[in-house]
Interface confidence: low
C-alpha cells in the first residue's frame, strides 16, 4: 500500500478508504507534495488579512495584508499597522519620531540621525523626522568662498 | 458533537511549571479551525492566551505570556497543550480550551469551549 | 493591540426588560465581534458571532448589532435565566476580550 500511495500525485491524497487509491483534494484544501495520506485545508484570509494568491489544490493561499497594515512574520502570520513616516509604532500607537532621530518608513522604528562629524563631514541638509541628514564634504573641502550647492534645509 | 476536556491544572510554586492538555473529541484538531488557550483570573474576565492554526503550525501568543508559555499539538492523540514555565502567582486561573468558530486565518470567534482546568500559583 | 470596552460595568434589571450592552473597539474590526454569557463556575456560551448572527440553540430574544467601532447586545425581554456575565470579544486582529458587564437582578 505504501508504494501505492507514494504514486499519488500532489493535489491528492492517498484515500485507503476507496478502490482509488488517489482522491483529488476536496474544495478548500491541497497538498503540496506527492504520497500524502490528507489534503491541508486552504488558509483563509480574512479580517486584517488579504489574498495575495488563491488557494490551488496544490499549494495553499498566500495572505497579504489589507491597506494601513503590513506583514510580519514568516508567510505573513501577523499584519502590524502602518505609521506615516516620521513616527514610529509603539504600544500607545503612532507616535512621532524624537527630535535627532527619523523614519522614512511606514513601518519600523525611528534611527538616529548620521552623524556626519564622526566622516569627518559637516551636514550639508540638516536631518527631519522623515529624513536623514545628508552629508558633505568636510569643512577643509570647501575652498574659500565656496558655498553648498544646496542651503540646509530648516530643521523641524 | 465537539467535545473538549481540559486536565492538568493544580497548585504550583513561583517559578515552576505545568503542563495542561485538552483532549477533543468529535472533531479533528487537524481540521481547518484555529485552537486556542484562554484563561479566567478568580473573580475577573477572560484573557485569550494562545492560539495555535488548524492548517499548520502557526502560533500566536498574549505579551504576558509570550517566552514563558508554549502550545503545541499531538495529532495523533488529537490532544491541544499548553505549557507552562516560569509561573508567576499572576498567572492563577482556570484554564479553557477553546475552537474557534470558523476557519479564518485569525478564527473569529470561539465556539467550543472545555470546562476549564484550575491553575493556582503559590508558595 | 485592540481593546474593547464594555458598558456599563453592571447593571440591575427586572425579569421582562429590555436590557442594552455595548462594546466599543479602540480601532475598526468591521463585524469581526462576538459576545458571549457566563454563568458562575461554568465555561462561556457563544451567544452571537460576526456582530449579528445568532448561534444555534440561542434564544431569539438575544440579537447583536453594530459594526467598526460600536456594537451593541440587545436582550429585548429578559429572563430569569439571563443573568449572569456578558463579554465581547474580537477576532479582527488576534483575540480580546472585552472586561465583562454583570446583569443583576433588581
Known amino acids: 500500500l505504501q508504494d501505492l500511495c507514494s504514486n499519488c500525485p500532489a493535489g491528492t491524497f492517498c484515500d485507503n478508504n476507496r478502490s482509488q487509491i488517489c482522491s483529488p483534494c476536496p474544495p478548500n484544501s491541497f497538498s503540496s507534495a506527492g504520497g500524502q495520506r490528507t489534503c491541508d485545508i486552504c488558509r483563509q484570509c480574512k479580517g486584517v488579512f488579504k489574498t495575495r494568491k488563491e488557494c490551488s489544490s496544490t499549494s495553499n493561499a498566500e495572505c497579504d495584508c489589507i491597506s494601513g497594515y503590513h506583514c510580519l512574520g514568516a508567510e505573513c502570520s501577523m499584519c502590524e499597522q502602518d505609521c506615516k513616516q516620521g513616527q514610529e509604532l509603539t504600544k500607545k500607537g503612532c507616535k512621532d519620531c524624537c527630535f535627532g532621530t527619523f523614519n522614512d518608513q511606514k513601518r519600523g522604528i525611528c534611527r538616529p540621525w548620521t552623524n556626519c562629524s564622526l566622516d569627518g563631514k559637516s551636514v550639508l541638509v540638516n536631518g527631519t523626522k522623515e529624513r536623514d541628514v545628508v552629508c558633505g564634504p568636510s569643512p577643509a573641502d570647501l575652498s574659500p568662498g565656496a558655498s553648498s550647492a544646496t542651503p540646509p534645509a530648516p530643521a523641524r | 458533537e465537539v467535545q473538549l476536556v481540559e486536565s492538568g491544572g493544580g497548585l504550583v510554586q513561583p517559578g515552576g511549571s505545568l503542563r495542561l492538555s485538552c483532549a477533543a473529541s468529535g472533531y479533528s484538531i487537524t481540521s481547518g479551525h484555529y485552537w486556542a488557550w484562554i484563561r479566567q483570573a478568580p473573580g475577573k474576565g477572560l484573557e485569550w492566551v494562545s492560539s495555535i492554526s488548524g492548517y499548520g503550525s502557526t502560533t500566536y501568543y498574549a505579551d504576558s505570556v509570550k517566552g514563558r508559555f508554549t502550545i503545541s499539538r499531538d495529532n495523533s492523540k488529537n490532544t491541544l497543550y499548553l505549557q507552562l514555565n516560569s509561573l508567576r502567582a499572576e498567572d492563577t486561573a482556570v484554564y479553557y480550551c477553546?475552537?474557534?468558530?470558523?476557519?479564518?486565518?485569525?478564527?473569529?470567534?470561539?465556539?467550543?469551549w472545555g470546562q476549564g482546568t484550575l491553575v493556582t500559583v503559590s508558595s | 493591540d485592540i481593546q474593547l470596552t464594555q458598558s456599563p460595568s453592571s447593571l440591575s434589571a427586572s425579569v421582562g426588560d429590555r436590557v442594552t450592552i455595548t462594546c466599543r473597539a479602540s480601532q475598526g474590526i468591521g463585524s469581526f465581534l462576538a459576545w458571549y454569557q457566563q454563568k458562575p463556575g461554568k465555561a462561556p456560551k457563544l451567544l452571537i458571532y460576526?456582530?449579528?448572527n445568532l448561534e444555534t440553540g440561542v434564544p431569539s430574544r438575544f440579537s447583536g448589532s453594530g459594526s467598526g467601532t460600536d456594537f451593541t447586545l440587545t436582550i429585548s425581554s429578559l429572563q430569569p435565566e439571563d443573568f449572569a456575565t456578558y463579554y465581547c470579544?474580537?477576532?479582527?486582529?488576534?483575540?480580546?476580550f472585552g472586561q465583562g458587564t454583570k446583569v443583576e437582578i433588581k
Open positions: 477553546a475552537r474557534g468558530g470558523s476557519d479564518a486565518v485569525l478564527g473569529d470567534w470561539f465556539a467550543y
Open positions: 470579544q474580537q477576532g479582527y486582529y488576534l483575540w480580546t
Open positions: 460576526d456582530a449579528s
